[in-house]
Interface confidence: low
């Protein structure tokens, strides 16, 4: 019970695995917390010990490595389940120690059930494909290390519940699923089921990911400011509310940061001594093109405010654009008794 460097519960590694399938889980110590790898630790005489805490319990207990058919085993820095059971769900701890050193980290493992159409509470990775962009592929994820290269697995791909066979533009090619040309209709969940033999038993690995067809870089353009534009004049009397929307269209660009901002007289609104509020809304098209609207609002506009320059700016990886709003002070309507009558030469 000597002191141990405890990295706590690593919730960033929310590991989910399917029931009745193999799972191999690497001790996170060597991946995220320590500056040396397992081999170095092992050579230095450190021992890796595994514990677990069952779901809804608070008692850390050793893992039983003497189950029939070695259902749970450890190999170097990997904890193996062949296969998992629903009640394996819990928090797992790996501890590296010798007589003078100790370091440990815990992580949650959730064993989830799936139905015959692969629906489950599993969080799915999203893979984006460019629309009508030519051949693209997705790869069956997280299957490395489950079987040696000498073993030839069988891989079956599904879209939703349906086996991908003779699909027009989607071709299973081993661990890869090739989209000869991607359309919106290809949006959906794709599952690969990898079947392989091991010691006279057959195991299945199920991996599902979500495919989202997005705008192609071929069609990407710099931001387009729809509003303000030259056709709309914001004419206000002092004391009225001034509302100017800045509406910008952004083509989808992978990993691009889309930005919209207002300047007033060349400064950020925060740097101007007036009561300005800016509200933003965002909408997306089916291909994840984005429309951002920022509404600049001055509750009670002054004649001074109506002389200022209001410019909407937008920026993406494709470029930067800006557009000024046309803001004017409304000329008061003439009062008949004085101005209008005089205009008609009345005395």
């Amino acid at each position: 019970s000597e002191r141990c460097d405890d990295w706590g519960l690593d919730t960033m590694r929310q590991i989910q695995v399917f029931e009745d399938e193999p799972a191999r889980i690497k001790c996170p110590l060597f991946e995220h917390f320590l500056k040396f790898n397992y081999s170095t630790a092992h050579s230095a005489g450190l021992t890796l010990i595994w514990y677990w805490t069952r779901q809804d319990r608070d008692l850390e207990e050793p893992i039983n490595f003497r189950l029939p058919e070695n259902r749970i085993s450890k190999e170097k820095d990997v904890l193996w389940f062949r296969p998992t059971l629903l009640n394996d769900t819990g928090n797992y701890t790996c501890m590296l120690r010798n007589t003078t050193y100790c370091s440990k980290v815990a992580f949650p493992l959730e064993v989830v059930q799936k139905d015959s159409c692969f629906n489950s509470p599993m969080k799915l990775p999203v893979h984006k494909l460019y629309i009508e962009y030519g051949i693209q592929r997705i790869t069956c994820p997280n299957v490395d290390g489950y079987f040696p290269s000498s073993v030839k697995p069988t891989i079956t791909w599904y879209m939703g519940c349906y086996k991908i066979q003779n699909f027009n533009n989607v071709i299973p090619e081993g661990m890869n699923l090739s989209f000869l040309i991607a359309f919106i209709s290809n949006n959906g969940n794709y599952t690969c089921v990898v079947t392989y033999p091991e010691n006279g038993r057959t195991f299945h690995l199920t991996r599902t990911l979500t495919v989202k067809v997005v705008g192609s870089p071929k069609n990407a353009v710099p931001p387009v400011i729809h509003s303000p534009n030259d056709h709309v004049v914001y004419e206000k009397e002092p004391g009225e509310e001034l509302l100017i929307p800045c509406t910008v269209y952004f083509s989808f660009l992978m990993d691009s940061r889309n930005e919209v901002w207002w300047t007033i007289d060349g400064k950020k609104p925060d740097d101007i001594p007036i009561d300005v509020t800016i509200n933003e809304s965002i909408s997306h098209s089916r291909t994840e093109d984005e429309t951002r609207t920022q509404i600049l609002s001055i509750k009670k506009v002054t004649s001074e405010d109506l002389k200022r320059s209001y410019v909407c700016h937008a920026r993406s990886a494709k470029g930067e654009v800006a557009k000024a709003a046309t803001v004017k002070q409304k000329v008061p309507a003439p009062r008949y008794t004085v101005e209008l009558a005089c205009g008609f030469g009345a005395t």
Partner: antibody, heavy 121, light 107 residues
């Protein structure tokens, strides 16, 4: 027994058009791609393109795009390769091959016997 | 497109010897590589698919190995009927491409 039987040898003049055929039998013709491969005299194999007879979806190698047209008539289990205007450089042996895109691999598992096209003035 | 480079261009061996043919891809193609044998005046014949799987009816003296970018076709104890040209072909992405071929000739 899976078989791909190609049409006979052709001798043509430059500028003429040509359509050669590849008839599949012994398997579900609409369930497999048919690829076309060129082999110029004394040279290696070049992939030209591929067609999915079920809906005639085609893919061409960039080198052959616009130079040839691949088509299929699923009612008679036949794929075609055609030229609108032949050139002397089109002289070659042309093979059709079935592309077996199974669950975990893709290959050209059955080949036609080849059609020799000679273009000479 | 993916370029496949085969080496050597020609391999001169005697019957009974072992032939080792190499195929290198310009980028990783996983295991999506096939090997074909072609004899003069004949259509190519599939020998190995998915880098290492033996096509039905092909003698077991033929074997394939490799993954990623480097692949090998090995013919143990060459028989007289094995003297031919061998092509590798990738099915990883369109356009499908072939290597330029390795001719195995009698020494």
């Amino acid at each position: 027994e899976v078989q791909l039987v190609q049409s006979g040898a052709e001798v043509k003049k430059p500028g003429e058009s040509l359509k050669i055929s590849c008839k599949g039998s012994g398997y579900s013709f609409t369930s497999y791609w048919i690829g076309w491969v060129r082999q110029m005299p004394g040279k290696g194999l070049e992939w030209m393109g591929i067609i999915y007879p079920s809906d005639s979806y085609t893919r061409y190698s960039p080198s052959f795009q616009g130079q040839v047209t691949i088509s299929a008539d699923k009612s008679i289990s036949t794929a075609y390769l055609q030229w609108s205007s032949l050139k002397a450089s089109d002289t070659a042996m042309y093979y059709c091959a079935r592309r077996n895109s199974a669950e975990n691999y893709a290959d050209l598992d059955y080949w036609g016997q080849g059609t020799l096209v000679t273009v000479s003035s | 497109e993916i370029v496949l480079t085969q080496s050597p261009g020609t391999l001169s061996l005697s019957p009974g010897e072992r032939a080792t043919l190499s195929c290198r891809a310009s980028q990783s193609i996983s295991n999506d590589l096939n090997w074909y044998q072609q004899k003069p005046g004949k259509a190519p014949k599939l020998l190995i698919y998915y880098a290492s799987s033996l096509q039905s009816g092909v003698p077991s003296r033929f074997s394939g190995s490799g993954s990623g970018t480097d692949f090998t076709l090995t013919i143990n104890s060459l028989q007289p009927e094995d003297f031919a040209t061998y092509y590798c072909q990738q099915s990883f992405t369109a356009p499908l491409t072939f290597g330029q071929g390795t001719k195995v000739e009698i020494k």
